[in-house]
């Protein structure tokens, strides 16, 4: 389990996104929703404060399909 009391920055954040997202790949920011004009990026959410697995997974890209 990810230790939620700690923050993830730089290489630690990239490592964890790569491992968790795997073949999906990942984004550093999500597209802004209709509700919010500005979407927080993962650095703001996981480096400046702690984040959990569920939040990390929201930055995984939409699964690609095999050719």
């Amino acid at each position: 389990a990810y230790r939620p009391s700690e923050t993830l920055c730089g290489g630690e954040l990239v490592d964890t996104l790569q491992f968790v997202c795997g073949d999906r790949g990942f984004y550093f920011s999500r597209p802004a929703s209709r509700v919010s004009r500005r979407s927080r990026g993962i650095v703001e959410e996981c480096c400046f404060r702690s984040c959990d697995l569920a939040l990390l997974e929201t930055y995984c890209a939409t699964p690609a399909k095999s050719e």
Partner: antibody
Framework: EVQLVESGGGVVQPGRSLRLSCAAS????????MTWVRQAPTKGLEWVAY????????YYRDSVKGRFTISRDNSKNTLYLQMNSLRAEDTAVYYC???????????WGQGTLVTVSS | DIVMTQSPDSLAVSLGERATINCRAS?????MHWYQQKPGQPPKLLIY???KLASGVPDRFSGSGSGTDFTLTISSLQAEDVAVYYC?????????FGQGTKVEIK
Amino acid sequence: EVQLVESGGGVVQPGRSLRLSCAASGFTFSNYYMTWVRQAPTKGLEWVAYISSGGGSTYYRDSVKGRFTISRDNSKNTLYLQMNSLRAEDTAVYYCTTEDYGYWFAYWGQGTLVTVSS
Amino acid sequence: DIVMTQSPDSLAVSLGERATINCRASSSVSYMHWYQQKPGQPPKLLIYGTSKLASGVPDRFSGSGSGTDFTLTISSLQAEDVAVYYCLQRSSYPPTFGQGTKVEIK
């Protein structure tokens, strides 16, 4: 050439502890996240634990959470797996592994056998 | 967790004949990855990204499939191909492997 060499396996009684080590060479260890994968006798492969390159992020499979701790010493190019409260179902060959993006679990050690038996 | 189910559990094929191994995921995945494990050795990456051969892998090995159904094919079985083959999904956390398929010579 990537080389991973595990050690520390052996026979242990249920409820006891064991610490596995994995000595890495042939690559810049501190730049790579690492994982442990295990293989029970005559069974398949099971991812066990993950640690980021600097050690700040760890993940575990549900069945070992709270009992196993993955850690690393980048100054010694060594990965560890501390296994506490061992159970018979933890009996397996434990492999130290790492990967490049897309080349998942591309590099493996030879494994170390852990037998939990009374 | 995504459950990976391989079929058959084992198969015996004559030298020079085709061997086909299937892997089904309980949910759709982006790609499938395949590993070969010979007795007394660690697994070795064989095919990544569904159909790409890892370095040094002979072209008699091929992979295909999409969604939930994937296939590993050995077009002309050689003696050195005797091994257990595993599929892996990395599209969903946690990573999960198939139970393995043992390939023997008939």
